[in-house]
């Protein structure tokens, strides 16, 4: 069965949008008007993972690109990257663990916890135009809360 997917954009709690910054990086910045067309559209796929009553496992691909957010160790630190995949094989229901995020909904906000590295979250900085990264703290300076906008 084809994996169930939806198209969406994400904005952090400060309303910063996510855009491409070079071929393999995302950054977060405030966009208005026509500039909103720059924001990346995600293909969010509902995949197998350690699902709970509070957490839904998803994979986050970039629409119409063979790129997926993935979590790997770099210099012994959990790191977020955009990874190129074979479009013939992805998305799939049984994604490798590094591609899987636990989507957590709290008070109408979403968090994306790495399945590979529990308690590490997709994060943005308070500052403008900084890379989207994997952060090991919530409720601190860095932003781990997002809202999702559906795209038809």
């Amino acid at each position: 069965a084809p994996v169930r997917s939806l198209h969406c954009t994400l904005r952090d709690a400060q309303l910063k949008s996510l855009v491409m910054s070079g071929p393999y990086e995302l950054k977060a910045l405030h966009l208005q008007g026509q500039d909103l067309e720059q924001q990346v559209v995600f293909s969010m796929s509902f995949v197998q993972g350690e699902e709970s009553n509070d957490k839904i496992p998803v994979a986050l691909g970039l629409k119409a690109k063979n790129l997926y957010l993935s979590c790997v160790l770099k210099d012994d630190k959990p790191t977020l990257q955009l990874e190129s995949v074979d479009p013939k094989n992805y998305p799939k229901k049984k994604m490798e663990k590094r591609f899987v995020f636990n989507k957590i909904e709290i008070n109408n906000k979403l968090e994306f916890e790495s399945a590979q590295f529990p308690n590490w979250y997709i994060s943005t900085s308070q500052a403008e135009s900084m890379p989207v990264f994997l952060g090991g703290t919530r409720g601190g300076q860095d932003i781990t809360d997002f809202t999702m906008q559906f795209v038809s």
Epitope: A1, Q48, E51, S52, K93, K94, P118
Partner: antibody, heavy 122, light 107 residues
């Protein structure tokens, strides 16, 4: 060798809380999920819920409001608590290990305990 | 939740017979289907996972096939120790759900 063993009182009074323990050996509870399954006398199998290696839980809807699954990794024990029991909760209760093979076979249950019969009666 | 419809609910057969049990899922589950054997007073034992993968130590007379919504479990030549109840389980998504079971009895 992978083993799971259920234990707990065989008789529980209506409206009370059923408490069971699953003690495991041959694997670490931090690496594998454990499910609970029950089987009323002479009937089929019903999946109750599970606790993952990281401690997150998934409870099956019909029992969700009465169910608590927790664990103690250091003691290699998983516990099940089911509150406000009735005669309909009389069953053999099993714990079973999740295969936990990411991107291959995550949700199957490969090893089971021998089960323990719990009767709800006054 | 995914509903699993297993048939027949009971079956009488003789040693040496070929026996087939079917399981139908209410939605496409790819190959995420397991078959268990349960003997009276014992825990279920996993025989086949992923639709057709025989578990280590399980005799080759047991086999499974199918994908999507329709699955088949076959015992090619019944042995005395095979008389038991068999269950299918979908492991595609939570909550996990079982078929109603097939009781295999001696004719």
């Amino acid at each position: 060798e992978v083993q799971l063993q259920e234990s707990g009182p065989g008789l529980v009074k209506p409206s009370e809380t059923l408490s069971l323990t699953c003690t495991v050996s041959g694997f670490s509870l931090s690496d594998y999920g454990v499910s609970w399954i029950r089987q009323p006398p002479g009937k089929g199998l019903e999946w109750i819920g599970l606790i993952w290696g990281g401690g997150d839980t998934y409870y099956n809807s019909p029992l969700k409001s009465r169910l608590t699954i927790s664990k103690d990794n250091s003691k290699s024990q998983v516990s099940l608590k089911l509150s406000s029991v009735t005669a309909a909760d009389t069953a053999v209760y099993y714990c079973a290990r999740q295969t936990n093979l990411w991107a291959y076979d995550l949700y199957s249950m490969d090893y089971w305990g021998q089960g323990t019969l719990v009767t709800v009666s006054s | 939740d995914i509903q699993m419809t297993q048939s027949p609910s009971s079956l009488s057969a003789s040693v040496g017979d070929r026996v087939t049990i079917t399981c139908q899922a209410s939605t496409d589950i790819d190959d995420d289907l397991n078959w268990y054997q349960q003997k009276p007073g014992k825990a279920p034992k996993l025989l086949i996972s992923l639709g057709s993968t025989l578990r280590p130590g399980v005799p080759s007379r047991f086999s499974g096939s199918g994908s999507g919504t329709d699955f088949t479990f076959t015992i090619s030549s019944l042995q005395p120790e095979d008389f038991a109840t068999y269950y299918c389980l979908q492991s595609d998504r939570l909550p996990l759900t079982f078929g109603q079971g097939t009781k295999l009895e001696i004719k």
